[in-house]
């Protein structure tokens, strides 16, 4: 599932390059392993912002699929309460390209520990 999430992120990156979305998004670029579920939640919430701002059907479908995949991969630990983690709004705001790069990095963390 996580490999498919990375495929979807690449697809979103390609789709966005053909558009002009200059949004800045809350981005966790240095994820601590004990906060990775919280960070994933923030990434997914911000992805929905991309979907809404783009108004693009392909981006919308890909984001929705990505959330479904991530949900299923995290169904056993998605409700784990991680303490001492930053709230999404406390994260640094970065452009979409940097946001997606950081997203791929966190997904790779999940792949490495699964």
């Amino acid at each position: 599932n996580w490999v498919n999430v990375i495929s979807d992120l690449k697809k979103i990156e390609d789709l966005i390059q053909s558009m002009h979305i200059d949004a800045t998004l809350y981005t966790e670029s240095d994820v601590h392993p004990s906060c990775k579920v919280t960070a994933m939640k923030c990434f997914l919430l911000e992805l929905q912002v991309i979907s809404l701002e783009s108004g693009d059907a392909s981006i919308h479908d890909t984001v929705e699929n990505l959330i479904i995949l991530a949900n299923n991969s995290l169904s056993s630990n998605g409700n784990v309460t991680e303490s001492g983690c930053k709230e999404c709004e406390e994260l640094e705001e970065k452009n979409i390209k940097e946001f997606l790069q950081s997203f791929v990095h966190i997904v790779q963390m999940f792949i490495n520990t699964s």
Partner: antibody
């Protein structure tokens, strides 16, 4: 008023195939994900398949995965369910349903068609 | 898979009474983004199911306010404050937080 009309049901032998259709009208079909749900005689509801708005993504339970294929033709406002290798336990009324977006709404099936009966028997 | 268990199987009521249907999931159905995709559907005899409640407590358009949904995590409830004749039928809870999406077994609301 949103309209969904399922058709294509009938009697088919075990191992056979059938294609169900669902004609949609009175809404912008391409703006909605769609699902199929079935109900065996005297039994409860079972989710069968979901397809994304553009048709790129599909989801199935293990009970039908590899045998059933959900697809859509947005130019014809029509949803399909191709059912292969049919079994007696696939006998049911099949409903098509419109899905509200996860991102902009509640991810619920807000309107349902009237259903079409599929009977698998020799 | 998430197992959805509804109780009771059958609920005999008098018109005007309050009715309460319970739905329990085998694991939390709060998704990673914090949403709980739990719906309630009503299927009247000989008809297609109809959406009543989505995301635990949101009433679908046109659904009377005597219907209310509540709950969190794994325990959910549908309440009908004053049962009317048109409310009779089969009620199903449904989770679509995790694939495969799953229905409860159904609760038949009938006249006592």
């Amino acid at each position: 008023e949103v309209r969904l009309m399922a058709s294509g049901g009938g009697l088919v032998q075990p191992g056979g195939s059938l294609r169900l259709s669902c004609a949609a009208s009175e809404f912008t079909f391409s703006n909605y994900a769609m699902s199929w749900v079935r109900q065996a005689p005297g039994k409860g509801l079972e989710w069968v398949a979901t397809i994304s708005r553009g048709g790129d993504y599909t989801y199935y339970p293990d009970s039908v995965k590899g045998r059933f294929t959900i697809s859509r033709d947005n130019s014809k406002n029509t949803l399909y369910l191709q059912m292969n290798s049919l079994r007696a336990e696939d006998t049911a009324v099949y409903y098509c349903a419109r899905r509200v977006s996860m991102i902009t709404g509640g991810w619920a099936m807000d309107y349902w068609g009237q259903g079409t009966l599929v009977t698998v028997s020799s | 898979d998430v197992l959805m268990t509804q109780t009771p199987l059958s609920l005999p009521v008098s018109l005007g009474d309050q009715a309460s249907i319970s739905c329990r999931s085998s694991q939390s159905i709060v998704d990673i983004t914090g949403n709980t995709y739990l719906e309630w559907y009503l299927q009247k005899p000989g008809q297609s199911p109809k959406l009543l409640i989505y995301k635990v407590f949101n009433r679908f358009s046109g659904v009377p306010d005597r219907f209310s949904g509540s709950g969190s995590g794994t325990d959910f409830t549908l309440k009908i404050s004053r049962v009317e004749a048109e409310d009779l039928g089969l009620y199903y809870c449904f989770q679509d937080s995790f694939v495969p999406y799953t229905f409860g077994g159904g609760t038949k609301l009938e006249i006592k």
